[in-house]
């Protein structure tokens, strides 16, 4: 018998979509061999309609796809816009159509349900609102109006104009009688439940002259939209529940194997710990729609997600909902990059950010995730030369190494820098990644003076001491500005005496500024790199003042060993009037990182997400 397994029978109706999952033993050979979906002919052959090698029959053009999930040992065939012509016997299989590694599937597509005689059909989504209209004649204008539901053989009163409401509908039904001009009454049922589906009868009057109207209410459980995203990538759930729930709390939940739907995030401030640092719930629009962005997708994020609206901020019967089935593809195009980077107070980190290499011209951004309320990610720096004021002199976004990766360097670290940061671009929104910066115990490896004052017209020499662990690295000095850090000439002055237990491989590399001018004032960095990969950096602020006495200035290491000048450091965090500058270039189609360039310096408590991939501040 074949080891392939799938649904033996699939029944659907015209216009619908089906999603057929075929299961195979996930051996190495099976994972990588051709997958196919073919239709069995009367003479026994099987004509390929779609395969994993890219073939799509003209019959399926624009309405079908085949996705392989090698890690699960499954592949999924999605077919949309079904017609009765699609009814027939099919095979899903591996390898060559005629070779027997297949499973037989019967697909039956029937005509959509027709209208019953004099019955109005109402098709409404679960949790939404239906208005059943009931016409009547003038002679019944003053008589009792009622709505019954057919339960088995018996009509059961649901609501009437005398004030009766069936307990199953309490708090979510009303009967409206239109003005005298219109011979119509209507029954409005909110928060529709699946159990509300069925045959209803409107009636005006109670005698043989009463007016009756049949209604068939179909309550649809939302079909989950299938979403396929890459491991380590990002997904956005767009949730449009309608203006009637604009002021009701919204939620996104993930169904566990039971009936529970565990809240992932809601507008009441709840957020699941597993999503800390990698989720944003975007502010809702006036029409009640909102979206949720999740980055750093993990294998365990796969599953069924529901978004909905309910005052409790969680799924309840009668919540209007939308559903998605998220598949996380482990054969990801998004490269592995460290999810945790560690640095020491006063030290630095260099973060590698992946982006879609097809979009090398895109604008690159780095933002700080803030968990307050529904989460936000104010921008800190971009590749167009903008840096948030509090980060001047200590943050730089470099296009290097390029070819799908950019680098962000942050130095003068304090405990307030611990937290989650997002790498993103204005291009492919699936390529948003998250990195957590942790501040650990330890001393910075590079030693520089705390702050330096140069004298106009004189020469200034600033030392940077590199321990022997960096002997094989390229050492550099550069002057920081908004667009990066421009390399400057420096002198290797031999071994450094700043390190205990460090041999001749330690180095003292000096920056020399000849004939200092006002333009020389600013931040200078010394650092190490290997090719286009950056390691640690240290920053020095050089102030320029008028000449007091002649001579050149040589800055000793005595100052470098002292704590950095607090004033200089603090100036990097000075309070700035809270402004949110909306950047129209960023996410035209969604406000995922809506508070762009917000200059309020929010809380940055470190939260350990238990990440397995870690990177020290100095490693690549």
């Amino acid at each position: 018998k074949s080891p392939i397994f799938g649904p033996e029978e699939v029944n659907s109706v015209e216009g619908n979509s089906v999603s057929i999952t075929c299961y195979y033993p996930p051996t190495s050979v099976n994972r990588h061999t051709r997958k196919y979906w073919c239709r069995q002919g009367a003479r026994g052959g099987c004509i390929t309609l779609i395969s994993s090698e890219g073939y799509v029959s003209s019959k399926y053009a624009g309405r079908a796809n085949l996705t392989n999930f090698p890690e699960n040992g499954t592949f999924v065939v999605n077919i949309a816009q079904l017609s009765q012509d699609d009814s027939g016997r099919y095979k899903c299989g591996l390898g060559i159509n005629s070779r027997g590694l297949s499973f037989d599937v019967s697909l039956e597509v029937s005509q959509g349900p027709g209208l019953l005689n004099d019955t109005k059909v109402y098709t409404v989504d679960l949790g939404r609102t239906v208005t059943i209209n009931c016409p009547f004649k003038t002679e019944n204008a003053q008589k009792r109006k009622s709505l019954y539901k057919q339960i088995g053989l018996y009509p059961v009163l649901v609501i009437d104009s005398s004030g009766y409401v069936n307990p199953n509908y309490t708090g979510r039904i009303r009967l409206d009688i239109q003005g005298t001009g219109q011979l119509l009454f209507s029954v409005v049922i909110n928060q529709l439940r699946l159990s509300d589906a069925g045959q209803y009868l409107c009636q005006a009057g109670d005698d043989s002259n009463s007016n009756k109207k049949n209604a068939d209410l179909q309550v649809l459980k939302p079909e989950p939209e299938l979403v396929y995203e890459d491991l380590r990538g990002s997904v956005t759930f767009h949730c449009a529940l309608g203006p009637e729930v604009a002021n009701v709390a919204k939620f996104l939940c993930r169904q566990s194997s039971g009936e529970n739907c565990d809240v992932v995030v809601n507008t009441l401030g709840k957020r699941a710990p597993a999503f800390e640092g990698r989720i944003l719930l975007n502010p809702q629009d006036k029409d009640g729609s909102f979206s949720v962005v999740i980055t750093g997708l993990r294998k365990e994020d796969a599953g069924r997600y529901l978004c909905g609206a309910h005052s409790d901020g969680q799924l309840q019967e009668g919540s209007p909902i939308q559903a998605w089935q998220l598949f996380v593809n482990e054969e990801s195009t998004i490269p592995r990059s460290p999810t945790v980077v560690k640095g020491v107070a006063g030290g630095s980190v260099a973060v590698l950010c992946p982006y879609n290499r097809k979009e090398s011209k895109s604008i690159k951004y780095w933002c700080l995730w803030e968990g307050a309320q529904n989460g936000r990610c104010p921008l800190l720096v971009d590749s167009e030369g903008w840096v948030k004021a509090q980060y001047e002199g200590r943050l730089s976004l470099l296009e290097e190494p390029g070819n799908g990766t950019f680098t962000v360097i942050l130095n003068q670290l304090t405990s307030r820098d611990a937290g989650f940061y997002w790498c993103l671009t204005n291009g492919d929104t699936l390529w948003r990644t998250t990195v957590e910066i942790k501040i650990i115990e330890g001393e910075p490896n590079l030693k520089v003076p705390g702050n330096v004052t140069a004298v106009l017209g004189e020469t200034l020499k600033v030392p940077c001491h590199f321990p022997c662990k960096f002997s094989s690295y390229e050492k550099y000095w550069c002057k920081w500005n908004n667009t990066g850090c421009q390399a400057l000439p420096s002198q290797d002055e031999g071994p450094s005496k700043a390190f205990v237990n460090c041999d001749e491989n330690s180095r003292l590399v000096s920056l020399t500024l000849n004939l200092v001018t006002r333009a020389d004032e600013g931040w200078y960095w010394c650092g190490v790199k290997q090719g286009h990969f950056y390691g640690e950096t240290a920053a020095v602020y050089v102030a320029v003042e008028e000449r007091k006495a002649a001579g050149s200035r040589d800055v000793s290491l005595a100052k470098a060993d002292a704590a950095p000048d607090e004033k200089v450091l603090d100036s990097g965090f000075r309070e700035i009037e809270n402004k949110a500058i909306q950047d129209p270039r960023l996410f035209a189609e969604e406000k995922a990182v809506a508070d762009t360039r917000d200059q309020a310096d929010g809380s940055r408590a470190s939260v350990d997400s238990g990440s397995s991939e870690e990177q020290g501040g100095s490693s690549r």
Epitope: F5, N11, K221, Q255, S257, E259, E317
Partner: nanobody, 126 residues
Framework: EVQLVESGGGLVQAGDSLRLSCAAS????????MGWFRQAPGKEREFVAT??????????YYADSVKGRFTISRDNAKNTVYLRMNSLKPEDTAVYYC?????????????????WGQGTLVTVSS
């Protein structure tokens, strides 16, 4: 929680038919998958058949041992799933359990199903 109650089991002759019913109550509005498993004396519980649905589409899965003899169906309005068993054999003797789930990764796996009924005994004599 979803409560599941099976009925329809009993003693039949080989070759006869039976119809099992499984009525679901409680929080059924997020249930998308219901299936039948069976456990013969001294054996592991095994997959028999599953029906999964999405809107007006049904997907039916069967174990090789029952293919062509058993049919799974559902009545959405009654929140009930049925298992029609034809051409019964003595080796079909077992306690038949109904199971329900909100998600479907692999219909054959027991741990995919969070809710289980108490079971109904089917005995097929030769």
């Amino acid at each position: 929680e979803v409560q599941l109650v099976e009925s329809g089991g009993g003693l039949v002759q080989a070759g006869d038919s039976l119809r099992l019913s499984c009525a679901a109550s409680g929080r059924t509005f997020t249930t998308y998958v219901m299936g039948w498993f069976r456990q013969a004396p001294g054996k592991e519980r095994e997959f028999v058949a599953t029906i999964a649905w999405s809107g007006s589409t049904n997907y039916k899965y069967y174990a090789d041992s029952v293919k062509g003899r058993f049919t799974i169906s559902r009545d959405n309005a009654k929140n009930t799933v049925y298992l029609r068993m034809n051409s019964l054999k003595p080796e079909d003797t077992a306690v038949y359990y109904c199971a329900a789930s909100t998600v479907l990764t692999d219909p054959r796996r027991l741990n995919e199903y969070a809710n289980w009924g108490q079971g109904t005994l089917v005995t097929v004599s030769s």
